[in-house]
């Protein structure tokens, strides 16, 4: 649910970390209306997912641990 | 050591509502998701949804949107799933189980099943 | 959503058998399987996360395999407490799908 590269809603699936090849975070105070991460998929899909969902965090955490130990 | 214990055996008319509990043990309840998947007699297991109950986030299985909630009660470490306008195809053995991303969103513990029968 | 297709549906085999179980996705699930062993009576059982990783308590006769959209779980040697119903499932994307179930029964 993108319009512009903003989100304008959130996915209503949950997504498992090996489908997520990275993310983008996007902020309500940055010219879009909500706070959102964009995962972007193995099939070159961009999906809007809710910060707050747990999965959600865990994917981000998942993803950023691994661009840490790169 | 992780329990799940299921609400005992129902038997309901067609186009009632039936609610399974499911109570907690063993591990931090809020850290797990709860997950809800039925077998029907001769049938194959079915995933109906779950809940992650640290936040009360649910995902439903499109089949039973509309049909399907799930709740959770963290003060007894209790997760609910309530099914309503029961049919005859309804009749099965419904699961509670422990969801766990470190097993691959695998389920790693399970309820014994509730036995719900659908009779007119 | 996803579709899981298992096969067989039922087999034959004896105490001591090398079995294969495959079970094929509608896309590429990228790994993101596992597989369940279920007894008459009992709750279902995790036996493989991940395509590839043994869950606790699993024996190592037990092992899977797969990639894309096609996996296998194998038992090395069949043991008598091993004939039961083992299901595949998708947990790649919501809903998670389950294949129809293989039987395994005593020859």
């Known amino acids: 649910a993108s319009n512009f590269d903003c989100c304008l809603g959130y996915t209503d699936r949950i997504l498992h970390p090996k489908f997520i090849v990275g993310f983008t975070r996007q902020l309500a105070n940055e010219g879009c209306d909500i706070n959102a991460i964009i995962f972007h998929t193995k099939k070159k899909l961009s999906v809007c997912a809710n910060p707050k969902q747990t999965w959600v965090k865990y994917i981000v955490r998942l993803l950023s641990k691994k661009v840490k130990n790169m | 050591q992780v329990q799940l214990v299921q609400s005992g055996a129902e038997v309901k008319k067609p186009g009632a509502s039936v609610k399974v509990s499911c109570k907690a043990s063993?591990?931090?309840?809020?850290?797990?998701?709860m997950h809800w998947v039925r077998q029907a007699p001769g049938q194959g297991l079915e995933w109906m949804g779950l809940?992650?109950?640290?936040?009360?986030?649910?995902n439903y299985n499109q089949k039973f949107k509309g049909r399907v909630t799930m709740t959770r009660d963290t003060s007894t470490s209790t997760v609910y799933m309530e099914l309503s306008s029961l049919r005859s195809e309804d009749t099965a053995v419904y699961y509670c189980?422990?969801?766990?991303?470190?097993?691959?969103?695998?389920?790693?513990?399970w309820g014994q099943g509730t036995l719900v029968t659908v009779s007119s | 959503d996803i579709q899981m297709t298992q096969s067989p549906s039922s087999l034959s085999a004896s105490v001591g058998d090398r079995v294969t179980i495959t079970c094929g996705a509608s896309?590429?699930?990228?790994?993101?399987l596992n597989w369940y062993q279920r007894k008459p009576g009992k709750a279902p059982k995790l036996l493989i996360y991940?395509?590839?990783n043994l869950a606790d308590g699993v024996p190592s006769r037990f092992s899977g395999s797969g990639s894309g959209r096609d996996y296998t779980l194998t038992i090395s040697s069949l043991q008598p407490e091993d004939f039961a119903t083992y299901y595949c499932?998708?947990?790649?994307?919501?809903?998670?799908?389950f294949g129809q179930g293989t039987k395994l029964e005593i020859k």
């Open positions: 189980a422990r969801g766990n991303y470190g097993v691959d969103y695998g389920m790693d513990y």
């Open positions: 063993g591990y931090t309840f809020t850290s797990y998701w």
């Open positions: 809940i992650d109950p640290s936040d009360k986030y649910t």
């Open positions: 896309e590429n699930i990228y790994g993101a």
């Open positions: 991940g395509a590839t």
């Open positions: 499932q998708n947990v790649l994307i919501t809903p998670y799908t």
